[in-house]
């Protein structure tokens, strides 16, 4: 387990769960990846979303030196998306289809975040979105954007855990 004190995470478990997240994120909105959604001049709005960037220690060397920086970053992102998937953007009208994988996706985000941070340990959770009520007519677009962004995020996280499981597991 990746506790803030610095012990190692269960890399293999994290790898399996992050792989499941990838599958669920794509099945939640399979069209997302095929649509061109370039957004011009979105500095203000993209700054509000957690990204895994070069300085986050998620490269092979950074993970070897101290995986905590990267794992904290991934944890922040998981909490961010978990909160969005639990908000009225997804729970409000128009209702999700009964067989929608969004519920499973939400639970898996929570599961992986708990695996990274067991009860009783606390990382700073920056970038938790401050949510106002969403407008029903724009929810489809918001869901679409969230799932597209989540797909990119979990793809990177899954690569991190795959590397960790292959090279850093005891």
């Amino acid at each position: 387990r990746a506790v803030p004190g610095g012990s190692s995470p269960a890399w293999t478990q994290c790898q399996q769960l992050s792989q499941k997240l990838c599958t669920l994120a794509w099945s939640a909105h399979p069209l997302v990846g095929h649509m061109d959604l370039r957004e011009e001049g979105d500095e203000e709005t993209t700054n509000d979303v957690p990204h895994i960037q070069c300085g986050d220690g998620c490269d092979p060397q950074g993970l070897r030196d101290n995986s905590q920086f990267c794992l904290q970053r991934i944890h922040q992102g998981l909490i961010f998306y978990e909160k969005l998937l639990g908000s009225d953007i997804f729970t409000g009208e128009p209702s999700l289809l009964p067989d929608s994988p969004v519920g499973q996706l939400h639970a898996s985000l929570l599961g992986l975040s708990q695996l990274l941070q067991p009860e009783g340990h606390h990382w700073e959770t920056q970038q938790i979105p401050s949510l106002s009520p969403s407008q029903p007519w724009q929810r489809l677009l918001l869901r679409f954007k969230i799932l597209r962004s989540l797909q990119a995020f979990v793809a990177v996280a899954a690569r991190v855990f795959a590397h960790g499981a292959a090279t850093l597991s005891p």
């Epitope: 649509m35 061109d36 959604l37 370039r38 957004e39 011009e40 979105d42 203000e44 709005t45 993209t46 509000d48 979303v49 969005l84 908000s87 953007i89 979105p129 949510l131 106002s132 009520p133 969403s134 407008q135 029903p136 007519w137 724009q138 489809l140 677009l141 918001l142 679409f144 954007k145 969230i146 962004s149």
Partner: antibody
Framework: KVQLVQSGAEVKKPGSSVKVSCKAS????????ISWVRQAPGQGLEWMGG????????NYAQKFQGRVTITADESTSTAYMELSSLRSEDTAVYYC???????????????WGQGTMVTVSS | QSVLTQPPSVSGAPGQRVTISCTGG?????????VQWYRQLPGIAPKLLIY???NRPSGVPARFSGSKSGASASLAITGLQAEDEADYYC???????????FGTGTKVTVL
């Protein structure tokens, strides 16, 4: 940078319809909504409705329900607003605007067309 | 009939601070919906000044600031300049109307 270019001024008879176009140049509006706002001479701004091109879904202000239709052609990045059963009170400047959201909040109408003057007169 | 009420006009001398209020109800600002502010010069399309009640888009001077409390929002302009003479509108979503609603508009005059 995206610009919205609207069609030219129109003069219409009461009871007829008008269709105003709004073309996005320098970009797409696939990940945005498009709103239409009007302003009668000397009056304030009034939201008429919005449209999300990638889903083809529209939302109309109660006041205009049944009289306004907003559509878009993604292939030409053009949005349209059609207002029917025109009356003299519909004389106004009609604006289209790009309606932007982040992942989880509403940003605002950040790019506007130049406006189209529609005059309804017998 | 707008459900967001603004004062018809406010005025101030150059360099002064003016504030414009925007009062909504329990289905708009009071329900937690964000507020945007727009400025409109005569004969020109409106321009976004404030989003999410308090945030300024890039390019908007720091002289403009927004706040929100309960069912009301405010726009403050500090260091008033001649070019600030314009009409200002607040906007929020209204759940009972199912769409955006613009405020009644406020004309700012620089004395």
């Amino acid at each position: 940078k995206v610009q919205l270019v609207q069609s030219g001024a129109e003069v219409k008879k009461p009871g007829s319809s008008v269709k105003v176009s709004c073309k996005a140049s320098g970009g797409t509006f696939s990940s945005y909504a498009i709103s239409w706002v009007r302003q009668a001479p000397g009056q304030g701004l009034e939201w008429m409705g919005g449209f999300i091109p990638i889903f083809g879904t529209a939302n109309y202000a109660q006041k205009f329900q049944g009289r306004v239709t907003i559509t878009a052609d993604e292939s030409t990045s053009t949005a349209y607003m059609e207002l029917s059963s025109l009356r003299s009170e519909d004389t106004a400047v009609y604006y289209c605007a790009r309606d932007r959201t982040s992942l989880y909040y509403y940003y605002g109408m950040d790019v506007w067309g130049q406006g189209t003057m529609v005059t309804v007169s017998s | 009939q707008s459900v967001l009420t603004q004062p018809p006009s406010v005025s101030g001398a150059p360099g002064q601070r003016v504030t414009i209020s925007c009062t909504g109800g329990s289905s708009s600002i009071g329900a937690g919906y964000d507020v945007q502010w727009y400025r409109q010069l005569p004969g020109i399309a409106p321009k976004l000044l404030i989003y999410r009640s308090t945030n300024r888009p890039s390019g908007v001077p720091a002289r403009f600031s927004g706040s929100k409390s309960g069912a009301s929002a405010s726009l403050a302009i500090t260091g008033l300049q001649a070019e600030d003479e314009a009409d200002y509108y607040c906007v929020s979503y209204d759940s009972s109307l199912g769409g955006y609603v613009f405020g009644t508009g406020t004309k700012v005059t620089v004395l």
